[in-house]
């Protein structure tokens, strides 16, 4: 989970291992800071829970990329 | 291809523990959020619980919470449910199942581990 | 918790006829950002695990014959067996993964009539 020892800087320290569909993804910010150990993405879930994954790894890649297209497809 | 083999019948007294195990080959484990589901003769499905990427630990249904422990052993790709303090209620057939990529549904599960408690 | 109910609990169809199992929601497991209905379906033959059959509440899952079709949203859903086969002769439950505890009906027996 993710950690703001300091806020407003939230870091990751940890990130999961397990796959997640992105069904259960809304939403993800990228943590960048130099405050923080290591670079991350932190998914938020369709019930409002905080993930943090490795940016590197290809699933959250691909998540990254269908919620981006999710988010430029305007709902009719 | 996942596949789950689990522990054998186990025939136990009231107030005993059991512990069933799932053995995971074709994939590695600590990759799988494992979950249990029980079936008492001719009953329903019921989740147990099982670990939950999105809470980022093991999660039990209310129903079971204190009474049962589900554990990891990733050098062995082996997952445990012990449950404690077993009743002639808890007579059922026990599942572990799981899905690759984690949604909340499973598509592959163990062939059932079958644990009756009788005095 | 959400609680599913299945409707009938039992039903007898002749061979070739169409089969339709309901599973209503305590409350929707829609989400309405991406569309998808968090809902499963399951056969079960005696002395098997479940089988997966559907899931978002209309996939076939793959190897599952296109005579089982799901469908429905937000709280009311059906399973249907268009021609119903031997083989189908099992428990079908619906499952709820949208929000824990994932929960499941209680089941609806399919005979032969």
């Known amino acids: 989970q993710p950690d703001a020892i300091n806020a407003p800087v939230t870091c990751c320290y940890n990130f999961t291992n397990r796959k997640i569909s992105v069904q259960r993804l809304a939403s993800y910010r990228r943590i960048t800071s130099s405050k923080c150990p290591k670079e991350a993405v932190i998914f938020k879930t369709i019930v409002a829970k905080e993930i943090c994954a490795d940016p590197k790894q290809k699933w959250v890649q691909d998540s990254m990329d269908h919620l981006d297209k999710q988010t430029q497809t305007p709902k009719t | 291809q996942v596949q789950l083999v689990q522990s054998g019948a186990e025939v136990k007294k009231p107030g005993a523990s059991v512990k069933v195990s799932c053995k995971v080959s074709?994939?590695?484990?600590?990759?799988?959020?494992m979950h249990w589901v029980r079936q008492a003769p001719g009953k329903g499905l019921e989740w147990m619980g099982g670990?939950?990427?999105?809470?980022?630990?093991?999660i039990y249904a209310q129903k079971f919470q204190g009474r049962v422990t589900m554990t990891e052993d990733t050098s062995t790709d082996t997952a445990y449910m012990e449950l404690s303090s077993l009743r002639s209620e808890d007579t059922a057939v026990f599942y572990c199942?799981?899905?690759?990529?984690?949604?909340?549904?499973?598509?592959?599960w163990g062939q059932g581990t079958l644990v009756t408690v009788s005095s | 918790d959400i609680v599913m109910t299945q409707s009938p609990d039992s039903l007898a169809v002749s061979l070739g006829e169409r089969a339709t199992i309901n599973c209503k929601s305590s409350?929707?497991?829609?989400?309405?950002?991406?569309?998808?209905?968090?809902l499963a379906w399951f056969q079960q033959k005696p002395g098997q695990p479940p089988k997966l059959l559907i899931y978002?509440?209309?996939t076939r899952e793959s190897g599952v014959p296109d005579r089982f079709s799901g469908s429905g949203s937000g709280t009311d859903f059906t399973l249907t067996i268009s021609r119903l086969q031997a083989e189908d002769v099992a428990v079908y439950s619906c499952?709820?993964?949208?929000?824990?505890?994932?929960?499941f009906g209680q089941g609806t027996k399919v005979e032969l009539k």
């Open positions: 199942a799981t899905k690759r990529e984690y949604s909340g549904y499973f598509d592959y």
């Open positions: 074709g994939y590695t484990l600590s990759e799988l959020s």
């Open positions: 670990f939950d990427p999105e809470d980022g630990e093991t």
């Open positions: 409350q929707s497991v829609l989400y309405s950002s991406n569309s998808k209905n968090y």
């Open positions: 978002w509440a209309s």
């Open positions: 499952q709820q993964y949208f929000i824990t505890p994932w929960t």
